[in-house]
């Protein structure tokens, strides 16, 4: 018969290294008689026999953790007791080894230039992973502005435009490497004016181009203000290259003004704005008020080609610096305004505007422009374009056109000479000739004047509405 023998642990527990989700086994070989009861603890807490995460075999001498989790880290002890002598204990550590894992990856960031940006990158792993960052395709170098914090996050002080780009963090230990997804750092820059418009002192009727260049991220928008209001006339051309917006406001100068360029861009819910102003003053301002002088020459332009008599001499007003060009731009601008009017009104208005801006001319010693006959002007105003004229006058009264009224250089009919008084003193508009009885065929025209003022124009066999002279080339 065997003699009773107190338990002796013949193979003390050792430190076990295990990867997450792998199996880890502690062996606790015991010699004793009678057979001991062996219990196991983790961090001094008893492991229950029915805990399905563990398997205890060989009379309790083998403890197997079936699928290691990172929380299984700790000190494991086996305690053997058979009632003979005292209980004996042996302990060993479980070190859960873990490939790097990024638990809080970086996210896309928009940041305003000059501020501080932090891109998070929290990691897990055993051994503790080292964290580095990649920008684009290259490893990111730390410097006085750029640092990788203990937590793994990337901190950039005083963010610059060149910091913009795609970043990813890299967590590395002896077991492997983990990469975050690419994230985008967008650096936003407040709108700033690079080139302010220049002030000009020009002659009446000159063309001036005001140029304003601004930079910012996002690319700013540029708007122009004339004497405190949105610019009512002129053409604006914009181009964008390399985040720089170049805006050119071309003006036909008939009055002095203060023009302000406003560059604006948006950062989240906030806007940043930069402004620059220039004055346009008119040299010899009184010149335009005097009786205009000019010269007679053939019309070489395009807009009124189909309207003006082919070989007629027209008057060019030398109060403009380049009369031919100035008058052509005026008519071109007016022509565009006419795109919205009715088919009945448009050819009549075109004939009126062209003959008003390019008046027939008698060369003589003093070149003399011949204005349109009052009756033809009234025909356009009160018959062909009655609705449009009333609408335009209404807008003018409500101040909708402000200084932009010159875009439609319409004559004041009442100030024009009558062809009944002196037929040689004014120009007829042949396109508007129509049979007197045709007047009654225009419904819904309400004249603002007595019917006696409706022109008595010469009868003609051609109907205004179908004259081929109105087709535009």
């Amino acid at each position: 018969e065997k003699l009773p023998k107190a338990p002796v642990i013949t193979t003390p527990l050792e430190t076990v290294d295990a990867l997450v989700e792998e199996v880890a086994t502690f062996m606790c070989a015991v010699e004793s008689y009678p057979q001991p009861e062996i219990s196991w603890t983790r961090n001094k807490i008893l492991i229950k026999l029915f805990d399905t995460r563990y398997s205890i075999r060989e009379n309790g001498q083998l403890l197997t953790i079936l699928s290691v989790e990172d929380s299984d880290d700790g000190i494991y002890c086996c305690i053997a007791n058979n009632g003979v002598g005292g209980a004996v204990e042996s302990c060993g550590a479980l070190q859960v080894k873990m490939k790097p894992k990024i638990t809080r990856p970086p996210i896309n960031v928009k940041i305003i230039e000059g501020l501080k940006a932090v891109l998070p990158c929290t990691t897990m792993g055993n051994p503790k992973p080292s964290v580095s960052w990649i920008k684009g395709d290259n490893a990111l170098r730390e410097n006085s502005r750029i640092a990788v914090l203990e937590s793994g996050s990337l901190r950039i002080h005083n963010v610059q435009k060149e910091d913009a780009g795609q970043y990813r963090c890299v967590a590395k230990n002896s077991l492997g490497t983990a990469y975050s997804k690419l994230v985008k750092l967008e650096v936003e820059v407040f709108a700033r004016i690079l080139r302010a418009p220049e002030s000009h002192n020009v002659t009446f009727g000159s063309f001036v181009t005001l140029r304003c260049t601004a930079i910012g991220i996002p690319v700013p928008t540029i708007s122009w203000i004339e004497n405190g209001n949105a610019v009512s006339s002129g053409s604006i051309q914009e181009s964008v290259k390399d985040r720089v917006i170049d805006s050119r406001l071309q003006l036909f100068i008939t009055k002095p003004g203060l023009y302000t360029c406003i560059a604006t861009n948006k950062h989240g819910e906030k806007f940043s704005t930069a402004k620059a102003a220039a004055t346009v003053s008119i040299a010899e301002w009184s010149k335009s008020q005097k009786d205009s002088q000019g010269y007679c020459a053939q019309y070489r332009g395009e807009v009124c080609d189909a309207v003006l008599a082919k070989d007629a001499l027209v008057f060019f007003n030398t109060s403009y610096r380049d009369p031919e060009d100035a008058q052509e731009l005026l008519i071109h601008t007016a022509w565009n305004e006419l795109k919205a009017v009715s088919p009945l009104c448009r050819p009549a208005a075109e004939a009126l505007l062209c003959n008003h801006l390019f008046q027939e001319c008698s060369p003589g010693v003093v070149p003399t422009p011949m204005p349109i006959c009052r009756e033809y002007c009234l025909a356009v105003k009160e018959l062909f374009c009655a609705k449009e004229w009333q609408a335009m006058e209404g807008k003018a009264h409500r101040g909708l056109y402000r200084s932009g009224m010159h875009l439609l250089p319409v004559p004041e009919c009442s100030k024009l000479p009558s062809m009944h008084r002196d037929p040689t003193a004014c120009t007829r508009l042949p396109y508007l000739d129509y049979k007197k009885e045709n007047i009654t065929t225009f419904p819904s025209i309400t004249s603002s004047r007595p019917s006696a003022d409706i022109p008595n124009l010469p009868a003609s066999t051609s109907s205004f509405a179908v004259s081929p002279a109105y087709s535009m080339t």
Epitope: R248, C296, R300, D322, E324, D325, E328, L329
Partner: antibody, heavy 121, light 112 residues
Framework: ELQLVESGGGLVQPGGSLRLSCAAS????????MSWVRQAPGKGLEWVSA????????YYKESVKGRFTISRDNAKKTLYLQMNSLKSEDTAVYYC??????????????WGQGTLVTVSS | QAVVTQEPSLSVSPGGTVTLTCGLS?????????PDWYQQTPGQAPRGLIY???SRHSGVPSRFSGSISGNKAALTITGAQSEDEADYYC????????????FGGGTKLTVL
């Protein structure tokens, strides 16, 4: 600095086609009319075609009408001359020239250095 | 089609005055032809001198002046200099059914 640079010239057989380009820089291209003018070797200047600032009309010398097409791309600051059904008498240096104003006709105040077109079999 | 006529060649002494003319084979040159004048030196592109009868292009010396004299356009060089030796072309705007621009045959100016 204002510059007009022509390209696209070369040797072509009678009946063939060429497209000349004129790249403009140093001025607001779409504020000016443009023209093509040619000069046969040892001869004088000959106006070929003109186009106003907005490309709204086109004008041609009678002998090239129906064969040549002038056009412009204001966004690209470029003037073009498409020449089809070329004849030996079209052999010349082709100059691109800028008008002093918007309309198609009038004084030419800036010229390119020209591109040579040779029509020969 | 009207032909624009110019003297084939002219000569002038340095410091002298010379007038080049530009006429039409049929009819007179008027301000409605907007006479323009161009200068071309060998191997170079033309250069604008005078536009619309009498206006000088920027950078053109004041010794060059334009006018209409009788039924012709005229370019006068007062105080000719050796660098003025060149070919001179006039250009006229023409309207006869369609718009046109016509150059004269050119005048070869020699400064002796």
């Amino acid at each position: 600095e204002l510059q007009l640079v022509e390209s696209g010239g070369g040797l072509v057989q009678p009946g063939g086609s060429l497209r000349l380009s004129c790249a403009a820089s140093g001025f607001t291209f779409d504020d000016y009319g443009m023209s093509w003018v040619r000069q046969a070797p040892g001869k004088g200047l000959e106006w070929v075609s003109a186009i106003p600032w907005n490309g709204g009309s086109t004008y041609y010398k009678e002998s090239v009408k129906g064969r040549f097409t002038i056009s412009r791309d204001n966004a690209k600051k470029t003037l073009y001359l498409q020449m089809n059904s070329l004849k030996s008498e079209d052999t010349a240096v082709y100059y691109c020239a800028k008008r002093s104003g918007r309309i198609a006709f009038g004084a030419l105040d800036a010229w390119g250095q020209g591109t040579l077109v040779t029509v020969s079999s | 089609q009207a032909v624009v006529t110019q003297e084939p060649s002219l000569s002038v002494s340095p410091g002298g005055t010379v007038t080049l003319t530009c006429g039409l084979s049929s009819g007179s040159v008027t301000s409605s032809n907007y006479p323009d004048w161009y200068q071309q030196t060998p191997g170079q592109a033309p250069r604008g001198l005078i536009y619309s009868t009498d206006s000088r292009h920027s950078g053109v010396p004041s010794r060059f002046s334009g006018s209409i004299s009788g039924n012709k356009a005229a370019l006068t060089i007062t105080g000719a200099q050796s660098e003025d030796e060149a070919d001179y072309y006039c250009g006229l705007y023409m309207y006869s059914g369609s718009k046109n621009y016509v150059f004269g045959g050119g005048t070869k100016l020699t400064v002796l």
